[in-house]
């Protein structure tokens, strides 16, 4: 019979054969031949091999660097890379979380929208009408102005997106 | 090795602009911030901001808010700064570092000179 | 904005004796997450700076084991056991707590 061009999912073609692949966890030892399959043997602590395949060498687990600000997320495992996120106030620069950014506060004038996360910094929204922001802060949101009507008080001085109002008696009616 | 290699000498007059640019290489790009801090002549240093190439991101220091922009492409791997209205105190050393386990590696320093 | 105060300011120190720089700061630089983010940085004469040591303690990689950093929330030393010819220049300290990011006024060391 004619030598195989193609083969199947799960196989590769060697020395004119279809030998099957690896599965993920574990690396190539040695080709199938025609009366041999393929051998292979699992990865060792600390590697991960996460597709099937014909590798030689599994890789190397990610190293979570303390000193960059990194922690382990997910341990890995022989089929999977270990998972870094950054340490608490801190976020990944990129998908790939190899350094830590510190998280940015909003200004005053500004409230946070949304907190920041492991991965994604803070988002920071300017204080509408209505509402002040006094504080640098990566948690506070823009606060409502106080109402002094509420309070049976009038305003004596208008609020802005940095300051409260401030609120005064009212000024009684002489008879 | 990771080098930053910035661009050269500017003299610049009253309210004009300068943009500096900062070639990284060495390392992945998108991996790491870089941030600017200036030095004026026999002062200190002064944290001007950064950008997260990832993300194009920045994040300025307030007191210059309003008045410089950091950009990165990814493309070239090289980030710039550029300081508008310029003022003769804005006379300095400017460096572009990149941050990883501190500011770990900065560019040689690019010498503007405010001057009418 | 947190402010770095160092001290002192001129250091003349005489090779092969100690030397110590103090740095203080305006709030305290220990984050709940247990680390204090303060960092030293020695500009050498006509250089860019360089950094030294990182969150507080641990010595960049290539610094001489002469270096050391200490302190609390607060109040943070540099020690050189034994200062050398080279160790000349300004040394920093800057806090990244949170932004902005500020340096030390700067600490000359030079060789008496």
């Known amino acids: 019979p004619e030598p195989p061009t193609a083969c199947r999912e799960k196989q590769y073609l060697i020395n004119s054969q279809c030998c099957s692949l690896c599965q993920p966890g574990q690396k190539l030892v040695s080709d199938c031949t025609e009366f041999t399959e393929t051998e292979c043997l699992p990865c060792g602590e600390s590697e991960f091999l996460d597709t099937w395949n014909r590798e030689t060498h599994c890789h190397q687990h990610k190293y979570c660097d303390p000193n960059l600000g990194l922690r382990v997320q997910q341990k890995g495992t022989s089929e999977t890379d270990t998972i870094c996120t950054c340490e608490e106030g801190w976020h990944c620069t990129s998908e790939a979380c190899e350094s830590c950014v510190l998280h940015r506060s909003c200004s005053p004038g500004f409230g946070v929208k949304q907190i920041a996360t492991g991965v994604s910094d803070t988002i920071c929204e300017p204080c509408p009408v209505g509402f002040f922001s006094n504080v640098s802060s990566a948690f506070e949101k823009c606060h409502p102005w106080t109402s002094c009507e509420t309070k049976d008080l009038v305003v004596q001085q208008a609020g802005t997106n940095k300051t409260d109002v401030v609120c005064g008696p009212q000024d009684r009616l002489r008879a | 090795e990771v080098q930053l290699v910035q661009s050269g000498a500017e003299v610049k007059k009253p309210g004009s602009s300068v943009k500096v640019s900062c070639k990284a290489s060495g390392y992945t790009f998108t991996s790491y911030t870089m941030h600017w801090v200036r030095q004026a002549p026999g002062q200190g240093l002064e944290w001007m901001g950064y950008?997260?190439?990832?993300?194009?991101?920045?994040n300025y220091n307030q007191k210059f808010k309003d008045r410089v922009t950091i950009t990165a492409d990814k493309s070239t791997s090289t980030a710039y700064m550029e300081l508008s209205s310029l003022r003769s105190e804005d006379t300095a050393v400017y460096y572009c570092?990149?941050?990883?386990?501190?500011?770990?590696?900065w560019g040689q320093g690019t010498t503007v000179t405010v001057s009418s | 904005d947190i402010v770095m105060t160092q001290s002192p300011l001129s250091l003349p120190v005489t090779p092969g004796e100690p030397a110590s720089i103090s740095c203080r700061s305006s709030k305290s630089l220990l984050h709940s997450n247990g680390n204090t983010y303060l960092y030293w940085y020695l500009q050498k004469p006509g250089q860019s700076p360089q950094y030294l040591i990182y969150r507080m303690s641990t010595l960049a990689s290539g610094v001489p084991d002469r270096f050391s950093g200490s302190g609390s929330g607060t109040d943070f030393t540099l020690k050189i056991s034994r200062v050398e010819a080279e160790d000349v220049g300004v040394y920093y300290c800057?806090?990244?707590?949170?932004?902005?990011?500020?340096f030390g006024q700067g600490t000359k060391l030079e060789i008496k």
């Open positions: 570092a990149r941050w990883g386990y501190s500011f770990d590696y």
């Open positions: 950008i997260n190439p990832s993300s194009d991101y920045p």
């Open positions: 800057m806090q990244h707590l949170e932004y902005p990011l500020t």
